[in-house]
Interface confidence: low
């Protein structure tokens, strides 16, 4: 039988009236167009809702735009736009919201050819109030605010200048100008490339990597000869330029550019790239473009100073500079991320890794599937997921894989079951374990989201006909109840809830089309009379986090702990509630030499976890610069893999290698950089 | 030097249960996991599980899950061992031993595995009527 | 559980000769196995572990092989002190299990 319409699955008493009770209708009174949407703050209820007409006239496009605000999670809403005096807002530029709960907001608005400046609206209290603010410049950016300071703004102009604001975008000051790309780092540091001769793009690889420390006063430049830079984690890294030829390789630097060591990476040509797909405060996870366009690289994971890298991944699939990767972050559970490869046949296919890169395996096939006609093997296959790539290809799937840090072990995404990634169209499955074990959800495509930290998954059909029906579940997908949230159905655009999937309230958003006019309708659905009750201690059970073998006494040890979390159990139908917190126990595990990667200039044979040196570099100089400077580089062949808290145990212990290196980088070494003051 | 060693002999009755302990010295107790093996007379030698010194978690083999208990006092770097409901088959030497794998038993094929290096002396337990 | 096979059930060698043990696994246990020596009235001793590397203080004649399911302990040439019941030992996958063994008896 089809998921959630077995004998097993009990109904929701009187879920109906409940739900009735709790739908709200809001019609807006716009004309189509385009709509966005943006929570101000978390847990503030607030939401900002932008929508925009174009009327093409034969000269010109006229604009109009509305701004809507609700202060109870979508339930209701009022017009807004008289706040910004009813100006054309600009949506490429979006609404930019303030960090935290700040309250901040700022809208960037269109303005008259002829104007010195563009305009801007700005709130700092939670968009009660705007205040209209005409610019210096005109922004070719979104501001940007600062992560520690939300008074500090940054933005770029469209003349290339770097324009900074320390009162919340009342007064700016150009710092800097020749800038092609800007972004804060910590402590309200800026980071910034400046091009010398003609133009970002003539002076690609010949840009110059500042970096100011106070808002413009005084500058240090930190790097030449510079193609982009990147911030991940507490890493700074920077694509240098070779001296002789046009390859150019990654330098990276953990005290914000005052010195740099080369990255244990292969160097790239003009037509590939650098992408860092995934950073913390530990490692990276690095993707470097096969040469040709081939579509594919590879993922190199870091140690923790982000110099050395082990190969992670082959034959990652990366189809271009800014293009489209499957890689995706399982934030549910510690340690799991999902990707494509491109195999040898051209087809794709998924692979996870469960212990941050250190190995990666096919999906377990779901047990309540079969294998479809890309399996060679009709009872041997396994699950791969659809994700950016399939999205841009146009296929069947209204959305990317979905997980939540509070909805523990939960993974949703659509998927086919096979040798590979079908062109078919998809199901949804589900895994409640962090992607070891999956089952169908949902047959046909759906749009998906978790709501009070999983107690409810919420679930709308992907059709091109109008819909008015919505499906619930509140057992992690298991048994699923369908809702008729109106008489009137409309065509769907989106599913909006609050960040954090901490809310109990879902918005269904779309449009209403009759014969004269078609308008903008919003449903908000709160859920919490479906979920009457607190959960209690009795509705939570133990789960065991990363569990294959329960026989084995490390069963769950993953880089050096493993972690114990109380559960909800899928039979309680209670409310885990805004405030809920993941209760976890971690417990520390004996180290092993899985527990540490090899070292520069030592690797692991097949099947072997001892690191053993290089051949090819015995008795050589190494491309290994660290700091810029000619030093020794002593190593016992094994360094502890970034974040892994095992103790005890193994402790490798090496005849200490005496590595003399050499720089073939000229990257600016620290007694060559200079600094500067306004 | 490292050495494990072990409470004296036992005589216990059917149904009774018996703990014998480890000292573990000569070595950082914490850096080892301890093993428990027996034999019955004039058998091979059988896992019964596994403890982490470290936090105490145990594994024990599905023969003896619910009758055995490992525990560790790492002030007086002990570990011990309590079977209970004994039984005549029960009659063996008891043996601790040093596993100092580190390892995920269940983990990938590259883990490496460094034996049970250090053993005790054995514990003899009769089970008898 | 996994299974671990040893053959033959007693091996009759004189001093100075080779002798070669069998230790056959049900499943994979990829390098994860140990070798022990076990003398009437003591407690095993550790021979070799991860299938091929010998234990601290163990003499060279003393080999192991193997990976995956097969291995071999191999003993160049038979001392008298060499005589005893030798086990195979997996840790692949809990529980930990041991062969039944194999006796090396004087010929």
């Known amino acids: 039988s089809a998921p959630g319409e077995d004998e097993e699955c009990g109904r929701v008493r009187d879920f109906v009236a409940k739900l009735a009770n709790n739908t709200h209708q809001h019609v807006f009174d716009d004309l189509r167009g385009s709509v966005s949407l943006s929570w101000v703050g978390d847990s503030t209820g607030v939401i900002l809702v932008l929508t925009t007409f174009h009327v093409p006239l034969v000269i010109m496009t006229f604009g109009q735009s509305k701004l809507y605000r609700s202060e109870d999670y979508g339930k209701n809403f009022k017009d807004i736009t008289d706040l910004i005096n009813n100006t054309f807002i600009r949506t490429e530029f979006g609404m930019a919201i303030g960090p935290e709960n700040s309250g901040k907001v700022v809208l960037t608005a269109e303005v008259s050819g002829g104007s010195r400046g563009g305009r801007i609206f700005r709130s700092s209290d939670f968009a009660k109030n705007f205040v209209q603010t005409d610019l210096p410049f005109h922004p070719l950016t979104q501001m940007m605010y600062s992560p520690q300071n939300s008074d500090y703004l940054l933005a770029l102009s469209t003349e290339n200048g770097l324009w900074v604001s320390k009162n919340f975008g009342g007064k700016w000051e150009e710092i800097h100008k020749a800038v092609c790309l800007a972004k804060w780092g910590s402590d309200n540091t800026i980071f910034f490339t400046t091009y010398a001769n003609g133009s970002c793009k003539a002076d690609l690889g010949a840009l110059e990597l500042w970096r100011t420390s106070d808002l413009g006063k005084s500058f240090k430049t930190i790097g030449v000869k510079i193609y982009s830079f990147g911030l991940g984690g507490r890493f700074l890294f920077a694509s240098v330029m070779a001296d002789k030829d046009t390859t150019r390789r990654i330098h990276v630097s953990t005290d914000q550019g005052d010195t740099w060591s080369m990255a244990q990476l292969p160097s790239v040509g003009q037509e590939q790239f650098y992408s860092i797909l995934a950073a913390n405060d530990d490692m990276v996870f690095m993707h470097v473009d096969e040469p040709g366009d081939t579509g594919f690289g590879t993922i190199f994971t870091s140690d923790d100073r982000g110099i050395v890298y082990s190969k992670s991944l082959d034959r990652h699939l990366y189809t271009t500079t800014g293009g489209e990767t499957d890689f995706t972050n399982v934030t549910s559970l510690r340690g799991v991320y999902i990707t494509s490869v491109l195999s040898e046949d051209n087809s794709i296919q998924t692979m996870i890794t469960f212990d941050q890169g250190g190995r990666w395996t096919h999906l377990r096939k779901p047990e309540n599937s079969e294998c479809d006609a890309t399996a060679k093997n009709k009872n041997e296959c396994s699950l791969h997921i659809h994700a950016s790539y399939s999205i841009s290809q146009k296929l069947n799937v209204p959305m990317a894989p979905l997980s939540e840090p509070n909805a523990v072990g939960i993974v949703i995404a659509h998927g086919s079951v096979g040798d590979a990634i079908s062109v078919m169209v998809p199901d949804v499955y589900i895994s409640d374990d962090g992607g070891y074990s999956w089952t169908k959800m949902l047959e046909g495509p759906h749009y998906y989201t978790i709501l009070d930290s999983g107690g409810i998954i919420v679930a709308i059909e992907h059709s091109s006909r109008p819909i008015n029906v919505i499906k619930f579940s509140t057992d992690e997908g298991q048994c699923w109840q369908t809702y008729t949230f109106t008489r009137d159905p409309i065509y769907f655009t989106g599913l909006a809830s609050e960040p954090g999937a901490r809310s109990m309230n879902i918005s269904i958003w779309g449009f209403t089309e009759s014969f004269l006019t078609s308008q903008w309708v919003s449903y908000t659905i709160d859920f919490k009379d479906i979920l009457e009750r607190n959960c209690e201690e009795k509705d939570y059970t133990i789960w065991l986090a990363h569990s294959t073998d329960p026989e084995d006494y490390e069963d769950g040890c993953i880089l050096g702990y493993k972690e114990q979390f109380l559960r909800l159990r899928k039979s309680s139908v209670c409310q885990n509630g805004r405030d809920y917190v993941v209760t976890k126990q971690p417990s520390i595990c004996l180290c092993s030499l899985e527990d540490f990667l090899c070292d520069f200039g030592y690797y692991r044979p097949e099947n072997d976890s001892k690191c053993v040196e290089q051949p090819e570099l015995k008795g050589h100089d190494l491309e290994f610069c660290l700091y810029g400077r000619e030093e020794h580089l002593t190593t016992n062949g094994y360094r502890k893999i970034p974040g892994d808290k095992c103790q005890g145990g193994v402790n490798p212990v090496r005849e200490v290698k005496d590595l003399k290196k050499k720089c073939t980088s000229n990257f600016l070494s620290p007694e060559k950089q200079n600094s500067k003051s306004n | 030097q490292v050495q494990l060693v072990q409470s004296g002999a036992e005589v216990k009755k059917p149904g009774a249960s018996v703990k014998v302990s480890c000292k573990a010295s000569?070595?950082?107790?914490?850096?080892?996991?301890m093993s428990w093996v027996r034999q019955a007379p004039g058998q091979g030698l059988e896992w019964m599980g596994i403890i982490n010194p470290i936090g105490g978690s145990t594994s024990y083999a599905q023969k003896f899950r619910g009758r055995v208990t490992m525990t560790r006092d790492t002030s007086t770097s002990t570990v011990y061992m309590e079977l209970s409901s004994l039984r005549s088959e029960d009659t063996a030497v008891y043996y601790c031993t040093r596993d100092p794998s580190g390892i995920a038993a269940a983990g990938p094929a590259s883990r490496y595995y460094y034996g049970m290096d250090v053993w005790g002396q054995g514990t003899t337990v009769t089970v008898s009527s | 559980e996994i299974v671990m096979t040893q053959s033959p059930a007693t091996l009759s060698v004189s001093p100075g000769e080779r002798a070669t043990l069998s230790c056959r696994a049900s499943q994979s246990v990829s390098s994860n196995l140990a070798w022990y020596q076990q003398k009437p009235g003591q407690a095993p001793r550790l021979l070799i572990y991860g299938a091929s590397t010998r234990a601290t203080g163990i003499p060279a004649r003393f080999s192991g092989s193997g990976s995956g399911t097969e291995f071999t302990l191999t003993i160049s040439s038979l001392q008298s002190e060499d005589f005893a019941v030798y086990y195979c030992?997996?840790?692949?996958?809990?529980?930990?299990?041991f062969g039944g063994g194999t006796k090396v008896e004087i010929k």
């Open positions: 000569g070595y950082t107790f914490t850096k080892y996991y």
């Open positions: 030992q997996q840790a692949r996958l809990g529980p930990w299990t």
